[in-house]
Interface confidence: low
């Protein structure tokens, strides 16, 4: 009677995490005696998958009886499958033997590959607020997939990045991978509404890819314009002068009035109004008495926003001329704007 | 055996390239990855990027983007490096590797070529 | 980028000694490192791959340890050949990158 023979006849099964892996294998003789063991690997390091004569194995199932004494076919079933799974399984025929069985011959080895989905990306961005013009990075990571391909890209608003660098780690061969990218977007000042979007493809995903996203209105500072304007007479003796703060964002923000350099008031913006791009406007006023000064007043509007060094715009008020002869921000001036980008 | 043989010492101008070869023997050239690592004098090794001699997948070092090409010439069983607009910071030994596929270790180096920017 | 630190950067010791030098990595990189000697004008010689495999023809006194973040390289009973630099490398993530190196010195 010729050799018995073990048959392997898939040289590899590709299995979807979570699915059951079915691994064939039969053998051409009833001789010798003996039991099957299934391994994963080869060489002295194999790992034991099943074993027909003894053990506990819950995951494994056989496919056919193997109490039927004509039985020749020893497939096996292994659920829920996860890229640890993954290798070469070996369906080992051994011979009766007294005291241990002998291994008598193996089959050519079936590769087990695992499918397995990405993770959900997760998108973080800086970890400081930046304000327009300057670049920030943000980082889109997923983790667990197999195979290693896997194709990322950025999207700004639905149009896609350029500059931004990828790894899929490890480098060498794995049962999973994991996915790292940093994108490099320039911030503008209508940004406040718009979204970074890491989007991962995968053979696993059936084209449908999976998408995180990042809002830039948790990283962008978009700094306020001040302007300083003095309004028509009340009464006599008494001018208003308001100070409008136009499109910061977000919107904490404090104000200090300062008449020749002296507090007056200090309040925060409160009842402010938004912008169609999300910034914010806000207006505050001074009714400044003339008769309790002798001479001219420089108002100043002090804007201290998001905790960045404040910001001033000044307007002098000439207690010589009769308040209804001035013009609208007379002498204006910008004591300078301080803004310092901390990202 | 399995050896590396690197082409010759090179003195280059600030601003020109330099391009080194890697002659593999000794075993199936396509069967591994060829890295190329530098050493400035007095320092430590630095990786510039590598090449899957089989498929040709190349993978450089965001420091020397743009500024390095390595090639490989799977019928002539070498691999190249080109390194362009040289400085003299560029002043190095340069070293060949090959590269296994899994855990991506060096375990075999040619000699080095040493690569002299000066003006 | 995965920075690999090495320590100390310099040691003396005599032959016969036991001597560790560690490297650690700024994130986990499993066990994707390797070990390398080198001596002056010569290429870097691969001695330990994988953490902790010995990679052929190297000589059992050396020994690698460590997974994760951490590890380790020890030379027990120290030859007169062994005084030499020694590299750390990460092959988790690219860019590789090497440690900064440990030379060790004769006492």
């Known amino acids: 009677e010729e050799e018995l023979q073990v048959i392997q006849p898939d040289k590899s099964v590709l299995v979807a995490a979570g699915e059951t892996a079915t691994l064939r294998c039969t053998a051409t003789s009833l001789i010798p005696v003996g039991p099957i063991q299934w391994f994963r690997g080869a060489g002295p390091g194999r790992e034991l998958i099943y074993n027909q004569k003894e053990g506990h194995f819950p995951r494994v199932t056989t496919v056919s009886d193997l109490t039927k004494r004509n039985n020749m076919d020893f497939s096996i079933r292994i659920g829920n499958i996860t890229p640890a799974d993954a290798g070469t399984y070996y369906c080992v025929k051994f011979r009766k033997g007294s005291p241990d069985d002998v291994e008598f011959k193996s089959g050519a080895g079936t590769e087990l590959s695992v499918r397995a989905k990405p993770s959900a990306p997760v998108v973080s961005g800086p970890a400081a607020r930046a304000t327009p013009q300057h670049t920030v990075s943000f980082t889109c990571e997923s983790h667990g997939f197999s195979p290693r391909d896997i194709t990322l890209k950025w999207f700004k608003n639905g149009n896609e990045l350029s500059d931004f660098q990828t790894n899929v780690d490890p480098v060498g061969e794995s049962v999973s991978y994991s996915i790292h990218s940093t994108a490099k977007v320039v911030l503008t000042r209508e940004d406040v509404h718009s979204q970074v979007i890491c989007e991962v493809a995968h053979v696993t995903l059936q084209g449908d890819p999976l998408r995180g996203t990042a809002n830039l209105s948790e990283t962008i500072r978009v700094p306020p314009t001040l302007e300083v304007t003095q309004q028509p007479v009340r009464a006599e003796n008494q001018v208003n002068v308001t100070c409008q703060v136009r499109k910061f964002y977000p919107q904490r923000l404090q104000l200090t009035w300062l008449e020749n350099g002296n507090v007056s008031r200090t309040e925060t913006a409160s009842t402010v109004t938004e912008n169609k791009d999300g910034t914010y406007n806000w207006m505050s006023w001074l009714l400044v008495n003339v008769s309790a000064h002798r001479d001219d007043v420089k108002l100043t509007c002090q804007v201290e926003h998001d905790g960045q060094p404040a910001v001033s715009k000044s307007h002098d008020l000439k207690v010589s001329a009769h308040p209804k002869e001035q013009g609208s921000n007379t002498a204006a001036e910008n004591t300078g704007s301080n803004e310092r980008n901390i990202y | 055996q399995v050896q590396l043989v690197q082409s010759g010492a090179e003195v280059k101008k600030p601003g020109a390239s330099v391009k080194v070869s890697c002659k593999a023997s000794?075993?199936?050239?396509?069967?591994?990855?060829m890295h190329w690592v530098r050493q400035v004098p007095g320092q430590g090794l630095e990786w510039m990027g590598w090449?899957?001699?089989?498929?040709?997948?190349?993978k450089y070092s965001q420091k020397f983007q743009g500024r390095v090409t390595i090639t490989r010439d799977t019928s002539a069983t070498t691999a190249y490096m080109e390194l362009s607009s040289l400085r003299s910071e560029d002043t190095a030994v340069y070293y060949c590797?090959?590269?296994?596929?899994?855990?991506?270790?060096?375990?075999?180096w040619g000699k080095g070529t040493t690569v002299t920017v000066s003006s | 980028d995965i920075q690999v630190t090495q320590s100390p950067s310099s040691l003396s010791a005599s032959v016969g000694d036991r001597v560790t030098i560690t490297c650690r990595a700024s994130?986990?990189?499993?066990?994707?490192l390797n070990w390398y000697q080198q001596k002056p004008g010569k290429a870097p010689k691969l001695l330990i791959h994988?953490?902790?495999s010995l990679q052929n023809g190297v000589p059992s006194r050396f020994s690698g340890s460590g997974s994760g973040t951490d590890f380790s390289l020890t030379i027990n009973s120290l030859q007169p050949e062994d005084f030499a630099t020694y590299y750390c490398?990460?092959?988790?993530?690219?860019?590789?990158?090497f440690g900064g190196g440990t030379k060790v010195e004769i006492k």
């Open positions: 590797a090959r590269g296994d596929y899994y855990y991506y270790y060096m375990d075999v």
């Open positions: 000794g075993y199936t050239f396509t069967s591994n990855a």
């Open positions: 090449i899957k001699a089989g498929n040709g997948e190349i």
């Open positions: 994130q986990s990189i499993s066990d994707f």
């Open positions: 994988a953490a902790s």
């Open positions: 490398q990460q092959s988790y993530s690219t860019p590789l990158s």
